[in-house]
């Protein structure tokens, strides 16, 4: 009762390999690395057949089919290029993930190269089967400032030079504060922007005083104060978080985070700002931007900006001592002694940024918080100091530069 000679499948083998097979002999069909046994349209690792009493085999020899990793997973803010001709997705094929430059960059400078493994999954040498991450690039505007003029007594900003600025607007279209885009879905603003004015008789901040996420929207890519254009993105708000140590009476820790309902599309007009890497040096020049009131109490048509120096903390404390106002460590001051250049009503929450010349990258120093009138002599603008609350911001948002 000898069974016919067996031919192993292409890209496969038969074990044990014998010259002759007799009744009750069993053979195991397996495939080379990168191939799977295919029998009746079912993929398996091995297939066993047996020599029957009547001298026939219990089954036909299956075929060996090359492993297919199928279409690779889509990468958010990324692209896929196939290194193999005809966009092959079979064993040993190679693909490369890349991020949508120049607005996204791959985390940890990963190569993005994935190979189709024998197990039928796309594998990267470092990340294994996990996909890479495309992080938003921060602080690198496509449009750079042409010149720096030495908000209140400011000058119009060039379109696209402040792509991180956000306008907080009531749903009816009335703007009320500024903010800055952090990462891909967070806005940092002033905490006092997100609640109603408190009763001087009972200045306690209650939940009922807070602005509901459904009461306002965020506008990114904005240049004109009231006019709109197609570069703008009007986005809903998911959640607001005020700093746990915020004091509405003294404006200590006047910082809040707004989570967007959806991430904006990053482009030449919408890009996040970088978080500060260290403390800010006094005397350093910073730029403050906003749509707040101008000279003669008029609102500007377009985004305005001023360039002013950071002021020594003790100088600022002395300036506000006669007004019985405390300038605490979580605040940073800027402006010129003679006044004239300052943030004003409507600028609150907006960005104060500085340029790291070595990296050519812009960093957030502070957010517009408070002051005595606008542009007054010997009265500097007071800003919420981002470096002081950076840990809290990173804990809430997960944003890293």
């Amino acid at each position: 009762n000898e069974c016919p000679e067996l031919q192993p499948p292409v890209h496969g083998k038969i074990e044990p390999s014998q010259a002759k097979y007799f009744f009750k002999d069993q053979v195991l069909v397996s495939c080379d690395t990168g191939y799977k046994v295919l029998k009746d349209n079912v993929e398996m690792d091995t297939f066993q057949i047996e020599c029957l009493k009547d001298g026939t085999w219990s089954n036909k020899i299956p075929t060996c089919k090359i492993v297919d990793c199928r279409a690779p997973g889509e990468l958010e803010h990324g692209l896929i290029t196939f290194s193999t001709r005809n966009n092959l997705t079979t064993y040993k094929s190679e693909i490369k993930y890349s991020c949508q430059e120049p607005y996204y960059k791959m985390l940890n400078n990963n190569t993005g190269i994935y190979t189709c493994s024998a197990q039928g999954v796309w594998m990267n040498k470092v990340l294994g089967r996990s996909l890479p991450t495309c992080l938003p690039v921060c602080g690198l505007p496509k449009f750079s400032r042409k010149l720096m003029a030495r908000i209140f007594n400011g000058r119009p900003a060039q379109k696209g030079t402040t792509p991180w600025i956000a306008m907080l607007s009531h749903l009816n279209g009335q703007p009320f504060c500024g903010g800055s885009l952090l990462g891909s879905s967070w806005i940092v603003t002033a905490a006092h922007c997100l609640h109603q004015s408190l009763d001087p008789e009972d200045p306690t901040l209650r939940d009922s005083d807070l602005l509901s996420p459904s009461d306002f929207k965020i506008i990114l890519g904005k240049h004109w104060r009231l006019r709109s254009d197609e570069n703008e993105q009007h986005l809903g708000v998911k959640h607001t978080t005020l700093h746990p140590q915020y004091d509405p009476n003294t404006f200590e820790n006047d910082v809040a985070l707004v989570e967007l309902l959806e991430s904006p599309v990053l482009n030449a007009f919408v890009m996040p700002i970088c978080l500060p890497e260290g403390p800010q040096q006094e005397g350093a020049m910073v730029i403050v931007s906003g749509w707040g009131k101008q000279f003669l109490q008029r609102f500007p048509e377009t985004l305005m900006e001023i360039e002013i120096p950071i002021v020594d903390h003790s100088t600022c404390q002395k300036a506000y001592a006669p007004l019985k106002k405390k300038v605490t460590r979580d605040m940073i001051c800027a402006g010129e002694k003679e006044g004239g250049k300052d943030a004003c009503a409507g600028d609150a929450g907006g960005p104060m940024v500085t340029l790291n010349r070595e990296r050519g990258q812009w960093y957030l120093v502070g957010t517009v918080s408070w002051g005595d009138d606008c542009g007054k002599k010997d009265r500097y603008g007071v800003y919420s100091y981002i470096h002081h609350n950076k840990d809290w911001i990173q804990r809430v948002t997960g944003v890293r530069n």
């Epitope: 009531h170 279209g173 709109s228 254009d229 993105q233 009007h234 986005l235 809903g236």
Partner: antibody, heavy 120, light 111 residues
Framework: QSVEESGGRLVTPGTPLTLTCTAS????????IHWVRQAPGEGLEWIGY??????VTWYASWVKGRFTISKTSTTVDLKMTSLTTEDTATYFC????????????????WGPGTLVTVSS | DIVMTQTPSSVSAAVGGTVTIKCQAS??????SAWYQQKPGQRPKLMIY???TLASGVPSRFSGSGSGTEYTLTISGVQCDDAATYYC?????????????FGGGTKVEIK
Amino acid sequence: QSVEESGGRLVTPGTPLTLTCTASGFDINNYAIHWVRQAPGEGLEWIGYIYARSGVTWYASWVKGRFTISKTSTTVDLKMTSLTTEDTATYFCARVLAGGGYANTGLSLWGPGTLVTVSS
Amino acid sequence: DIVMTQTPSSVSAAVGGTVTIKCQASQNIGYSSAWYQQKPGQRPKLMIYGASTLASGVPSRFSGSGSGTEYTLTISGVQCDDAATYYCQSNYISSGSVDGTFGGGTKVEIK
């Protein structure tokens, strides 16, 4: 940049019909698209809205589920069912001036319209 | 739905004169209103949004005002080219609804 409607034709009452709005020169996913209709010699009538990126839709109350706005990767469709002679009109799709689902900056980009005639 | 009541339904004006069209919303929509111009056989054209902001390329003789429930479109120094039908529209958006209802239209004729 432009939008253009297609699919309008003569149909008998009760026949379903799908109109398509195709965008050129911009990513339709980043803007809210509205459908508006105008019966012969009459005023403009708002049908509804879609923000393609999130798929969120809103309709005028008179629509009562007869019309559905949906998106494909590059177009926005208006599916119409239970058509009556009252639905005879030129149908426009229009894009909001600014991007994002919360833009209420007016409809700045209109298609030429496509005529739907419902007649037995 | 929000109801937009537009008045008058038609108006006649002399070249150089002033035309005022009013629109009343059935509920407070803040500054969320727009105005359109439509000439026979043409698609509508955005003229004003945000109650008072002039759309790009629109002549400065057109102006919009109002908020809440009352809105006005004014054409100062009317020209022959302004003969058209004008529509107001609610651009109301909240986290729970979107409304784009139009007013009934005002036909402007030039004498």
